[in-house]
Amino acid sequence: APVPPGEDSKDVAAPHRQPLTSSERIDKQIRYILDGISALRKETCNKSNMCESSKEALAENNLNLPKMAEKDGCFQSGFNEETCLVKIITGLLEFEVYLEYLQNRFESSEEQARAVQMSTKVLIQFLQKKAKNLDAITTPDPTTNASLLTKLQAQNQWLQDMTTHLILRSFKEFLQSSLRALRQM
């Protein structure tokens, strides 16, 4: 697994470097998670032909994965910092159960899957420090999460492969949208 942000050898070798600002730390954390997702996608694509599946076929899935919409205030038109930040944190919290699902889905990248999960937790904590209105954030209901996880794990092999691919693709897209929005804040 790659070394988490702030622990690479360059950081150790340059103690005089200015400490990262909160925004830089968040940016670096997202890019680190995106690198981890790329590695996981590589294993998924090597293992199955899901990556060639047409967008239309993938769109027919019934997964309720977090997605950015116009009303979330994260796009350039209608940008709203606080609304967007709430959406990013809420979305990341909603992705947690899907990241839990991914934990047993990889053979050679098991550590990488765990690193993505743990790094996402760290990112959520960074973002919470930035948010002014935590009351607007609804956390996932554990009972709902449990039945979702059970349902996902009960799928046949082909559907599990498809689900893994969809989670990684959606999470990547969500993080990329988040990164663009956070750079405007």
């Epitope: 159960v97 990241l99 839990e100 699902y101 935590l134 956390t139 996932p140 554990p142 449990a146 039945s147």
Partner: nanobody, 118 residues
Framework: AVQLVDSGGGLVQAGGSLRLSCAAS????????MGWFRQPPGKVREFVGR???????NYADSVKGRFTISRDNNNNTVYLQMNRLKPEDTAVYYC????????????WGQGTQVTVSS
């Protein structure tokens, strides 16, 4: 598994306050979510509020602004501070822990009775 022990219930007059505690013992206590539920007499158990691993809290509409959940990780304890109590808050209160994001509430306290008299 984690053992949860609820305490702090009692008889209180309408408008009064109580603080319930939920102490955890067992393996390392860092659950995904801790929740409070209640079961009024003759009714089904209902959600009161929860606090997730990162400290974000959510409450049922009926208790918003009156009840506050907090946690003390050093003492492995979660609290439910109940202010401006009403007779309809009378119930057995339970705390519950979800150990992981996909586990559901997999540990429950034994419950503590709260009675609010008018």
């Amino acid at each position: 598994a984690v053992q949860l022990v609820d305490s702090g219930g009692g008889l209180v007059q309408a408008g009064g306050s109580l603080r319930l505690s939920c102490a955890a013992s067992g393996r390392t206590f860092s659950p995904y979510t801790m929740g409070w539920f209640r079961q009024p007499p003759g009714k089904v158990r209902e959600f009161v509020g929860r606090i997730n691993w990162s400290g974000i809290r959510n409450y049922a509409d009926s208790v918003k602004g009156r009840f506050t959940i907090s946690r003390d990780n050093n003492n492995n304890t979660v609290y439910l501070q109940m202010n401006r109590l009403k007779p309809e808050d009378t119930a057995v209160y339970y705390c519950a822990a979800a150990s992981q994001s996909g586990s559901g509430y997999d540990s429950w306290g034994q419950g503590t009775q709260v009675t609010v008299s008018s």
